[in-house]
Amino acid sequence: RGVFRRDAHKSEVAHRFKDLGEENFKALVLIAFAQYLQQCPFEDHVKLVNEVTEFAKTCVADESAENCDKSLHTLFGDKLCTVATLRETYGEMADCCAKQEPERNECFLQHKDDNPNLPRLVRPEVDVMCTAFHDNEETFLKKYLYEIARRHPYFYAPELLFFAKRYKAAFTECCQAADKAACLLPKLDELRDEGKASSAKQRLKCASLQKFGERAFKAWAVARLSQRFPKAEFAEVSKLVTDLTKVHTECCHGDLLECADDRADLAKYICENQDSISSKLKECCEKPLLEKSHCIAEVENDEMPADLPSLAADFVESKDVCKNYAEAKDVFLGMFLYEYARRHPDYSVVLLLRLAKTYETTLEKCCAAADPHECYAKVFDEFKPLVEEPQNLIKQNCELFEQLGEYKFQNALLVRYTKKVPQVSTPTLVEVSRNLGKVGSKCCKHPEAKRMPCAEDYLSVVLNQLCVLHEKTPVSDRVTKCCTESLVNRRPCFSALEVDETYVPKEFNAETFTFHADICTLSEKERQIKKQTALVELVKHKPKATKEQLKAVMDDFAAFVEKCCKADDKETCFAEEGKKLVAASQAALGL
């Protein structure tokens, strides 16, 4: 029943152009190129996209025309390799162009940079943006796609089209409003925050596929879709998992046209078969394509069937457990995961995968025994501590969050993680700990039944950010170990890390703790980041500092910033009071 089996097309580029339409075709090619060549100027990319589009049109007119039979990788790779400054701008990435497909595409993929050296996107004045939007809407929207894609080289391309559609709608509405800023800025903030979250979620999917393989991704998908569609049969869930895996494999592999096309087909299939999938899809399926796909991806869990029998009957008590396992190991484990997940929307996906792994390990051992049942009879008892560990962790951390509030909770995590992995760069520790801290406001408000899937699956996304940033410049064996050993045990691995006793404290550098009047004009968020950066540096200098010592220094620091920002001569205040603060902090911490 695969929705993706198509007849072979003479011209793949013509086929995708016709399926997607010119607008989406051009947008997706722009995203693909910007995700590969992240440093190239906007104008260069637009030129390449236009050339590819013109070529595609010739192929639509005549599929037998010269080069129309070439693969998309060949066509796009050839086009990218025409960039004149490839060697100067990208260094060794230029060597990819000496390779043949498919090695050339793999080479480009390996050079995607999760943390490209690009300037921060500064938002212009609203009037400036509205003028630019009205002057050339098409260029304005292309620029949005380009800027997001180059900064987020794994952004889920069909979803970026959805973001661009909302971006356009925001400007269309708000640039006509009486108070443009009041209308537009909250919408842009929302898009920015949602976009960052979407990028991070997709990055985990790609890491799962690329670092742990298709089986790992499929297991994740079985668990998540079974929670979401508990009324669907196992065969239906399996079919959706197969198709979803194809979509994400394509997008993560840079095959954005195929990915977007197949995602559209999958949405169509789901909507045509909603009766056997979920009762919650009706509203989604009435929407236009991009909204429909987004809506399906975010749809709430359907209600669980009322009459689900005990799991023990089929997976513990049955005398045919080992026979069924031998018959088709992955199918049997998939059924176990499906049955467990559809009964437990209150568990995180990673917990469900840990339980399935425990079950698999137990069967591997017990099915080799002379009396398997005697061996695996108590397997469900082994699940108890695995379930209780995240429950207890979430309970403790939500209590701490409620006590401290988000900023101070982030600070507690900053200290905790800096002590665990002090070798990691300060910007990475700040970014990751701030995001870890957001779990409080995101998830602690939920009732017990929704807390774990919210919190632990969110933490998986954030810790993957740490893993991909650390992979670029590895500095900590402990981070490498937690990131590479097991995808589902990353969070427990990091949770279990204690203070790194082998760490040699960083030399004290007064410059790190020197602040200037420019801090006063920063937004509250930027000011927090400055203070949190100082906190990480403090812990790196004095990893054995107590919570009380650090709190005292940070309180003094906050008072110092507040005082100097109120002073008439701010710069002099920062210089003089700053020296005093550094001296007092050194004394307090015994530096």
């Epitope: 005398k319 045919d320 457990v321 080992c322 031998a326 099915c367 080799a368 025994a369 002379a370």
Partner: nanobody, 114 residues
Framework: QVQLAESGGGLVQPGGSLRLTCTAS????????MSWVRQAPGEGLEWVSA????????RYADSVKGRFTISRDNAKKMLYLEMNSLKSEDTAVYYC???????ASQGTQVTVSS
């Protein structure tokens, strides 16, 4: 797909011997414990003997202890049951199964009669 094929059954006089063989395919035989079970005419299934994947653990029903010997050859994907001092009550269809599961094969008929 899992396939198990038993052979070696036949008609034998009381006190006689037989060696049953089970040929396995379609799964990683060397990773699974195996058993022999039997079903006498008009009776339910009776477990006879089991062996762990690495042959380190062998178990027998009280009714066959000391007379039957289970063994396996993982390289050949074969399971054996050596039956000595056969009695009329050993008459049954014998099946090899994965673990202690239910039969999914034809079995081999063993008849002990004078």
């Amino acid at each position: 797909q899992v396939q198990l094929a038993e052979s070696g059954g036949g008609l034998v006089q009381p006190g006689g011997s037989l060696r049953l063989t089970c040929t396995a395919s379609g799964f990683t035989f060397g990773s699974f414990g195996m058993s022999w079970v039997r079903q006498a005419p008009g009776e339910g299934l009776e477990w006879v003997s089991a062996i762990s994947a690495d042959s380190s653990d062998k178990r027998y029903a009280d009714s066959v202890k000391g007379r039957f010997t289970i063994s396996r050859d993982n390289a050949k994907k074969m399971l054996y049951l050596e039956m000595n001092s056969l009695k009329s009550e050993d008459t049954a269809v014998y099946y090899c199964v994965i673990g202690r599961g239910s039969p999914a094969s034809q079995g081999t008929q063993v008849t002990v009669s004078s």
